[in-house]
């Protein structure tokens, strides 16, 4: 399962985390900083 950086047009998509591209799934994914969740790491749950 390979991952790469998201394309530049995804800049700012992940609000509190790192945008990665899951190659096998053809999907952008936000790897959230701890304390954040949600598809775009938009929700602070602490």
């Amino acid at each position: 399962v390979s991952i790469t950086k998201c394309s530049s047009d995804m800049n700012g998509y992940c609000l509190h985390g790192q945008c990665i591209y899951l190659v096998d799934m053809s999907q952008n994914y936000c790897r959230c900083e701890v304390g954040y969740t949600g598809v775009r790491c938009e929700h602070f749950f602490l």
Partner: antibody, heavy 118, light 108 residues
């Protein structure tokens, strides 16, 4: 296929510590955070905490601070949870679970049964 | 912490019957962060419904979920034998994350 393989059942004496493991396979381990959950007859499911497999940071349920310590070894795609100063109250099944896209716990390990008895 | 109260604790239903169980939160939970898990004896919990109303992969269409704020529910339109299990609601809105005590669904 995504799998979380946990270490085997443990029978330990009160007062000691135990470290249980959760090995991820079938996916890129450092993409998804891992949670630990306790299941006992008395209290159903209890969230212990979550650890970022990439950053290494952890957040604990206040109730388990000082009791549980979560760590990650990225090189072996394995998460660990150490439980300290064990008492009979710690006897339970402990699960690791992967946090999916968005936040549901989409894959769970098979569970590690911990029995604390003298 | 957010307390999730599930009712009923135990229920039984006949084949083909419509089943509804509820999950009431002690304070408001965003519908995006309310999930349901199914657990059968001797097995791990399985993600069943996520973000209130989305069925997890492989979950039959007879299941549905709804709700908002403090009141959520899981419904089975036509009970089947394989649906016998314990269902837990779970919130990821505020730390500590919490689970309900479960609704055990039995076949009558």
């Amino acid at each position: 296929q995504v799998q979380l393989q946990q270490s085997g059942a443990e029978l330990v004496r009160p007062g000691v510590s135990v470290k249980i493991s959760c090995k991820g396979s079938g996916y890129t381990f450092t993409v998804y955070s891992l949670h630990w959950v306790k299941q006992s007859h008395a209290r159903s499911l209890e969230w212990i905490g979550v650890i970022s497999t990439y950053y290494g940071d952890a957040i604990y349920n206040q109730k388990f601070k000082g009791k549980a310590t979560m760590t990650v070894d990225k090189s072996s795609s394995t998460a660990y949870m150490e439980l300290a100063r064990l008492t009979s109250e710690d006897s339970a099944i402990y699960y690791c679970a992967r946090e999916g896209n968005g936040n549901p716990l989409d894959y769970w390990g098979q569970g590690t049964t911990l029995t604390v008895s003298s | 912490q957010i307390v999730l109260t599930q009712s009923p604790a135990i229920m039984s239903a006949s084949l083909g019957e419509r089943v509804t169980m509820t999950c009431t939160a002690s304070s408001s939970v965003s519908s995006s962060y309310l999930h349901w898990y199914q657990q059968k004896p001797g097995s791990s919990p399985k993600l069943w419904i996520y973000s209130t109303s989305n069925l997890a992969s492989g979950v039959p269409a007879r299941f549905s979920g709804s709700g908002s704020g403090t009141s959520y529910s899981l419904t089975i339109t036509n009970m089947e034998a394989e649906d016998s299990a314990t269902y837990y609601c779970h919130q990821y809105h505020r730390s500590p994350l919490t689970f309900g005590a479960g609704t055990k669904l039995e076949l009558k």
